[in-house]
């Protein structure tokens, strides 16, 4: 793709704003970021060269105040204050606060339960295949295969304990070492970071908030591929992870510990078992080759059954075959042996809308794909629209200060040190990472939590996910223990390793800089979101999964080139950036390549004659389906019917520069006013949140 | 109750056939095998094959391999044992006994026996 | 095939003693032994099978045991109705393998 868009005839300079640069560019220059945001899609604006790295002024015809795109907006209070209100007017605000408290509860209630339904829609649609994936024998020599395997399966599913617990199975069972399951394992984590990066294209219908939020998701995406970048290689070449993990072990007598808590989904668990219910051992089944399971349905009928325990008289070929010396015998024509069999009775079927349509499982998990991605979007929407209600002057400054602010000086650096022991509680709480930075981004993007404060946040769940996995281990049965403990304990140690890596230095916090890059682009190329999210879980792993298929050299002969491509980009852009003059006069810029490799302009026109098509026909009953057409399309204007994103375009082309909708408005009621979402008499009487 | 009625006795001439029948009642004669034992006068038990009903399926013992063959109809309930190629040796009396397919618990019911007598 | 060897090849005891028939078999067999009671002129009839099990009627003075090659057939109290010669079978393999009887007497 294109290395460093759009860079025109400028010069080098790590000060301007580089569309593709993963940095955080100094204030100033970042006055010129959002002028240059605008593209054919928009009203004209100022354009504005990028200027030399020697210049001194940057003349430039702007509003003096344009924040930084990634400055938190302030969510101002335009209700009547509460020392104002008479009696009447306190009671009705104070039953209006609890009414939106219950509702912000109900629809983040339902936000989890959409993920849950999400997980086993995605288990019925791929799950047969994610139990394929790891029936493949080259993972056991191949850890870059083991890899893709990971992230393809978790994708697939959905969750990355389902696919870790295939795993341990498999290393209980002898089908696989732990040694060839550690990259898997890798690549789960990475695997169930697209959860979240989903939930953020839930919230593209603000470019400004979609900036955050997509930015916020995608920081867990980056500390994942890099962490493995670093230390898949590291693995390999040292197996330090399983050397750690090993010791702890066998140092250790364990004893049977208890069922890890499930504290979230005693709560979830009633409702979405009404949905569907799975299966989930069939996946495991046929991950370890059972025939049987390939033709069995992931669709949980009888949820009572009785288990017998019998034995029954089986024929063998001869009495060298027998199971039993002693249960054996023949009746002069057939040989006979006993064989314990645990005879299944069915008694009860489960309670779900799905039990009785005997659909195939393919067309159970479309349909709850669509109505999850659908409940899911809807809750979203309705909980950033309650939070931003409710987080409005004095609530929304406490709260960002709360979690924004960092001790006072000299324990500044225990901040974020407690974030992630935060995201590490909660994520236990919760029981799964998905859910938790899932919830986490939407509140970046209306901007209550920074980025900065969400990375340690997001690796704090990374870690709270694993300390589940350590106790569920502790739980297993006595032949499972050691192997789920270890492959537990892997994954542990794997998340430390990449927080050692990517949190302690700020100058190695590269997944905040990255995110930024990316959510900069996204925001600009909304279609770009979707390329990044297909490209990076599905195109990429599947590629590798191919290439390692056709074999080893196959593998190497792709992937040295391309590595070496990358590398080159890399050093050839960090030389641009900080000493160009010891560059070519051609290769201080990348004008030497042709536009389509160094700008996602022409890329864009492409997507947007491709979507051209559908423009017109874009139904949009809904704002769900808006947003879906906004990202889609990238043009607000074929949703004609639905006021969702038109408005705030029309308000954004009345400007000189090109605003962030909606921070520049006093206040979200005023800014959600323009976007015709909210009537204008509200926001008179909307009341302070107590 | 159960019950295995034989043919009667037979007098043979060396070289000649003989073919026993054994009529089954009492019982679900599918599900169980049709075994046949002979015992020459004085002499003990001496296994000569069997036959599950249901499917055909028969095992002779090595020495009456191609002399013997056990056959079932279902219809009536019968099995019949047909010895060729008598030789005086052959004297003896048949048994038609049942054994319960699938199971271990032996021949546990026996027809009263068939004499044969090869003599020239 | 699986050769049975009974012994003794008869035996004379006084009605109420015990009696104790053996039976070797030439290879294990496992507990795949059943034994036959065959009063003179009748027919053969199940008393034991699975070496230690007792067939339905049989009376309870009748006990079988042993496993793999050595197996005893047990009279604990000796009837004037149990004069009959005693066969033992294995059922372990192909071909069914009777031994050569144990004639039984009263005394």
């Known amino acids: 793709m294109a290395p460093w868009p759009e860079l025109g005839d400028a010069q080098p300079n790590p000060d301007k704003y580089l569309e593709g640069a993963a940095g955080q560019q100094p204030t100033a220059p970042d006055k010129s970021k959002e002028t240059n945001k605008t593209d054919n899609t928009e009203a004209p604006v100022t354009k504005i060269e990028l200027l030399p790295s020697y210049s001194t002024a940057t003349l430039i015809d702007e509003p003096t105040e344009v924040d930084d795109p990634w400055n938190l907006p302030t969510l101002q209070d335009s209700g009547i204050k509460w020392s104002e209100r008479d009696t009447k007017g306190k009671i009705l605000c104070f039953f209006q606060g609890i009414g939106r408290l219950i509702l912000l509860l109900g629809f983040l209630y339902f936000f989890v339960c959409s993920l849950d339904i999400l997980s086993s829609a995605f288990q019925l649609v791929g799950g047969k295949m994610a139990g394929q994936f790891f029936s493949n024998s080259s993972i056991m020599s191949n850890p870059l295969l083991g890899l893709v395997i990971g992230v393809l399966v978790t994708v697939l599913v959905q969750s990355s304990s389902t696919s870790t617990s295939i795993v341990v199975s498999m290393v209980s069972s002898s089908l696989l070492t732990v040694r060839a399951a550690i990259p898997i394992i890798m690549g789960a984590n990475i695997g169930t970071s697209i959860t979240n990066t989903i939930v953020a294209l839930m919230q593209v219908g603000d470019r400004s908030e979609f900036r955050r939020a997509f930015a916020g998701a995608t920081v867990h995406d980056f500390f994942n591929w890099l962490s493995v970048l670093v230390l898949l290689p590291v693995e390999v070449a040292t197996h330090y992870l399983e050397i750690i993990t090993q010791l702890i072990v066998e140092s250790f007598h364990f004893k049977n510990g208890e069922d890890a808590p499930d504290l979230l989904k005693v709560i979830t668990k009633p409702f979405t078992k009404l949905i569907v219910q799975l299966d989930k051992k069939v996946i495991s089944q046929i991950a370890m080759n059972d025939e049987k399971a390939k033709n069995k349905s992931l669709v949980k009928i009888w949820c009572k059954t009785f288990t017998n325990k019998t034995q029954i008289n089986v024929t063998v070929p001869s009495t060298a075959n027998c199971t039993s010396p002693s249960l054996c015998w023949t009746d002069g024509i057939q040989n006979w042996t006993m064989k314990n069999v645990t005879y299944k009775e069915n008694i009860a079927k489960c309670q779900h809308i799905f039990v009785n349509f005997h659909l195939p499982d393919l067309a159970v998990g479309t349909i709850l794909l669509i109505l999850s991605l659908l409940v899911l979007c809807g809750c979203l929407i309705m909980i950033v629209k309650i939070l931003g209600s409710v987080l409005k002057g004095q609530v929304a400054t406490v709260i960002k200060k709360t979690i924004n602010t960092d001790f006072p000086f000299p324990f500044a650096w225990l901040t974020g040190y407690l974030a992630i022991l935060v995201g590490a509680g909660m994520t236990f709480i919760v029981q799964s990472s998905s859910v938790f930075t899932s919830a986490l981004t939407p509140l970046i993007g209306i901007g209550v939590i920074t980025i900065e404060r969400a990375y340690p946040l997001t690796l704090g769940s990374n870690i709270g996910t694993t300390t589940t996995a350590i106790l569920a281990a502790l739980a297993s049965p006595g032949n499972a223990l050691r192997s789920s403990l270890q492959i537990a304990l892997c994954h542990f140690f794997f998340n430390i390793s990449g927080i050692l890596l990517w949190y302690p230095i700020p100058f190695t916090r590269l997944p905040i800089r990255m995110a930024k890059g990316l959510g900069n682009i996204s925001a600009k190329y909304r279609w770009f979101a979707v390329f990044y999210l297909i490209i990076f879980f599905f195109l990429i792993p599947l590629t590798v999964f191919g290439l390692s298929l056709a074999g080893w050299r196959v593998l190497v002969g792709v992937g040295v080139p391309v590595v070496f491509i990358i590398i080159l980009v890399l050093c050839l852009r960090l030389l641009q950036s900080r000493c160009p003059r010891v560059l070519p006069k051609k290769l201080q810029n990348w004008n030497f390549l042709p536009l389509w490799m160094r700008s996602l302009k022409p890329w864009d026109a492409v997507v947007s004659k491709f979507t051209g098509c559908f423009q017109m026909r874009c139904c949009c009953c809904c704002r769900v389906c808006c947003r879906a057409c906004c990202l889609l399309c990238d043009c607000p204007k074929c949703c004609r019917c639905s006021k969702c994103c038109e408005d705030l375009e029309e308000a954004q082309e009345g400007q000189d520069v090109p605003v962030k909708a909606p921070e520049t408005f006093d206040n979200i009621t005023i800014s959600r006013e323009a976007q015709g979402e909210v009537p204008a008499s509200d926001s008179k009487t909307e009341c302070t949140a107590l | 109750q159960v019950q295995l009625v034989q043919s009667g006795a037979e007098v043979k001439k060396p070289g000649s056939s003989v073919k026993v029948s054994c009529k089954a009642s009492?019982?679900?004669?599918?599900?169980?095998?049709i075994h046949w034992v002979r015992q020459a006068p004085g002499q003990g038990l001496e296994w000569m094959g069997g036959?599950?009903?249901?499917?055909?399926?028969?095992n002779y013992k090595q020495n009456f391999r191609g002399r013997v063959t056990i056959t079932a109809d279902e219809s009536t309930s019968t099995a019949y044992m047909e010895l060729s190629s008598l030789r005086s040796e052959d004297t003896a009396v048949y048994y038609c006994?049942?054994?319960?397919?699938?199971?271990?618990?032996?021949?546990?019911?026996w027809g009263q026996g068939t004499t044969v007598t090869v003599s020239s | 095939d699986i050769q049975m060897t009974q012994s003794p090849s008869s035996l004379s005891a006084s009605v109420g003693d015990r009696v104790t028939i053996t039976c070797t078999a030439s290879?294990?067999?496992?507990?795949?032994v059943a034994w036959y009671q065959q009063k003179p002129g009748k027919v053969p009839k199940l008393l034991i099978y699975?070496?230690?099990t007792r067939h339905t009627g049989v009376p309870s003075r009748f006990s079988g045991s042993g496993s793999g090659t050595d197996f005893t057939l047990t009279i604990s109290s000796l009837q004037p109705e149990d004069v009959a010669t005693y066969y033992c079978?294995?059922?372990?393999?192909?071909?069914?393998?009777f031994g050569g009887g144990t004639k039984v007497e009263i005394k």
């Open positions: 006994a049942r054994w319960r397919n699938a199971y271990y618990s032996a021949m546990d019911s």
């Open positions: 009492g019982f679900f004669f599918t599900e169980y095998i």
């Open positions: 036959i599950i009903p249901n499917n055909d399926v028969t």
């Open positions: 290879q294990d067999v496992g507990t795949a």
């Open positions: 699975w070496a230690s």
């Open positions: 079978q294995q059922y372990r393999t192909s071909p069914l393998t």
